[in-house]
């Protein structure tokens, strides 16, 4: 169950990070 929660949180963070990049034009972290 914890793995699933971690995966879900990771997905949300990924979406938020992509949105941040699209909004700001900053370069993605390598």
């Amino acid at each position: 169950r914890k793995n699933l929660q971690d995966f879900a949180a990771c997905g949300i963070d990924r979406m938020n990070y992509d949105s941040y990049l699209a909004q700001t034009g900053k370069s993605p972290a390598k």
């Epitope: 992509d18 699209a22 909004q23 034009g25 900053k26």
Partner: antibody, heavy 112, light 112 residues
Framework: QSVEESGGRLVTPGTPLTLTCTVS????????MSWVRQAPGKGLDWIGY?????GAYYASWAKGRFTISETSTTVYLKVNSPTTEDTATYFC?????????WGPGTLVTVSS | ALVMTQTPSPVSAAVGGTVTINCQSS????????LSWYQQKPGQPPKLLIY???TLASGVPSRFKGSGSGTQFTLTISGVQCDDAATYYC????????????FGGGTEVVVE
Amino acid sequence: QSVEESGGRLVTPGTPLTLTCTVSGFSLSRYAMSWVRQAPGKGLDWIGYIDIGGGAYYASWAKGRFTISETSTTVYLKVNSPTTEDTATYFCARGVANSDIWGPGTLVTVSS
Amino acid sequence: ALVMTQTPSPVSAAVGGTVTINCQSSQSVFNNKWLSWYQQKPGQPPKLLIYFVSTLASGVPSRFKGSGSGTQFTLTISGVQCDDAATYYCQGSDYSSGWYSPFGGGTEVVVE
């Protein structure tokens, strides 16, 4: 939250022209801004953008032909040496992708 | 460089029917999901419909659906309404020392 372009007019070939994009309701310190153009009856051409650090980036075809800059509430697009092929409506839009706020556009006509 | 290709255009649809618009990228878009769809009506700026392949923009009706991954993407309009008559554009993005976000050539949807 809105953006509005201005400065479009009739110019002769080779005469530099600067377009203005005025933003309200959000900060350029948090959002990049893109420029897109559309020739009459044609599709959308992505020109480039300016990021939140003030760095300007261009499509390969647009390099040298355009210059993007900004102040605290305004973004500029300079058409360095217009040709008749630059006749188009020019839009500014919020973000480098997923652009959710667009201005109505400003028409540039290049003719001798 | 990233090139976006749309097919077909124009496409006809009956009121209440379904329309499918395809968009192909010359290489994978960033993170396999930096793909947006816009609707544009004559005399108006583009309106964001869908971003990150399948996420519906705020206020967009659920009859619009985006799908796909990698280099092949689709916009599906179900229960087509007269108001859906417009030109639709995909926009892909990739990063290489700067973002590059070109548009497809556009697909006109005619509602009969």
